[in-house]
């Protein structure tokens, strides 16, 4: 089968600081040296890009400076962290992997990770 399978967890709960981490793992049909990883958010059948990074195998994942994502790679596994999340950002986050080089190109799309974000309760003022 000429297809690339991408696995990611079904559900992740963001921390109280609005940080969510999950692993995106892909079964590579070829020996790629250049890989692009994109995180997409799907809400009401609308898909928007959250962040993207291209990396050379063996090198670190580098997102843009203003990106809300960070990540590390190890073989065919990418550890993704999304920060600055709020309750309104709760939704399905899809990991998309593209084997860019060498040919042939392969596309892999995960089933998505449902990230739940709960805004922390504000601390009550304390009287001393």
């Amino acid at each position: 089968c000429k297809a690339m399978h991408v696995a990611q967890p079904a559900v992740v709960l963001a921390s109280s600081r609005g940080i969510a981490s999950f692993v995106c793992e892909y079964a590579s049909p070829g020996k790629a040296t250049e890989v692009r990883v994109t995180v997409l958010r799907q809400a009401d059948s609308q898909v928007t890009e959250v962040c993207a990074a291209t990396y050379m195998m063996g090198n670190e994942l580098t997102f843009l400076d203003d990106s809300i994502c960070t990540g590390t790679s190890s073989g065919n596994q990418v550890n993704l962290t999304i920060q600055g999340l709020r309750a309104m950002d709760t939704g399905l986050y899809i990991c998309k992997v593209e084997l860019m080089y060498p040919p042939p190109y392969y596309l892999g799309i995960g089933n998505g990770t449902q990230i739940y974000v709960i805004d922390p309760e504000p601390c009550p003022d304390s009287d001393f």
């Epitope: 089968c1 000429k2 049909p29 692009r36 392969y106 799309i109």
Partner: antibody
Framework: QVQLVESGGGVVQPGRSLRLSCAAS????????MHWVRQAPGTGLEWVAV????????YYADPVKGRFTISRDNSKNTLYLQMNSLRDDDTAVYYC???????????WGQGTMVTVSS | EIVLTQSPGTLSLSPGERATLSCRAS???????LAWYQQKPGQAPRLLIY???SRATGIPDRFSGSGSGTDFTLTISRLEPEDFAVYYC?????????SGQGTKVEIK
Amino acid sequence: QVQLVESGGGVVQPGRSLRLSCAASGFTFSSYGMHWVRQAPGTGLEWVAVIWYEGRNKYYADPVKGRFTISRDNSKNTLYLQMNSLRDDDTAVYYCARAGDLGAFDIWGQGTMVTVSS
Amino acid sequence: EIVLTQSPGTLSLSPGERATLSCRASQSVSSSYLAWYQQKPGQAPRLLIYGASSRATGIPDRFSGSGSGTDFTLTISRLEPEDFAVYYCQQYGSSPWTSGQGTKVEIK
């Protein structure tokens, strides 16, 4: 709104060159792979070439490899197809298309006709 | 290269009838990477279905896609006058990107 507009088609003699352009608007051009697809009169769709994101990675269909060059200028939101050594069987309507977030070709231009004839 | 074969070549039906179009792949295609397009004369193709079964934005629910492996189907539950056109299936999971030869749905 999201739009692709091709230009540059015309009638050209075999062996000559032509450059097609595709102007994009309404979306972040550099975030998408862009394809050229052609359709010879009365036939189906034939994929021609793709260029990804920053423009470093390109792929071509075998019939055009070595003759056609795909490029993009992200600062101008424009995709190009330089067609050299044109042959009769390159006669077709040429479409540019965007590779959507989930991979399918979700936005298409209206097409530009290229006729190779002596 | 993955070869896609569509059948029938032409489908002659009346408005209100159900249309069933087939697309068969020469090797297994992940359902995540199969699309259907509609093309009317003198117009560009329009994305109808992606991921074998998900409708693109603005596509009416009379269009549905199904299938997996090597066999995929596009169904139009009740043909409207504007549905008479040519339909193409396409795989986009690996290069080269390939399409079927098309099925023409014409008015009987």
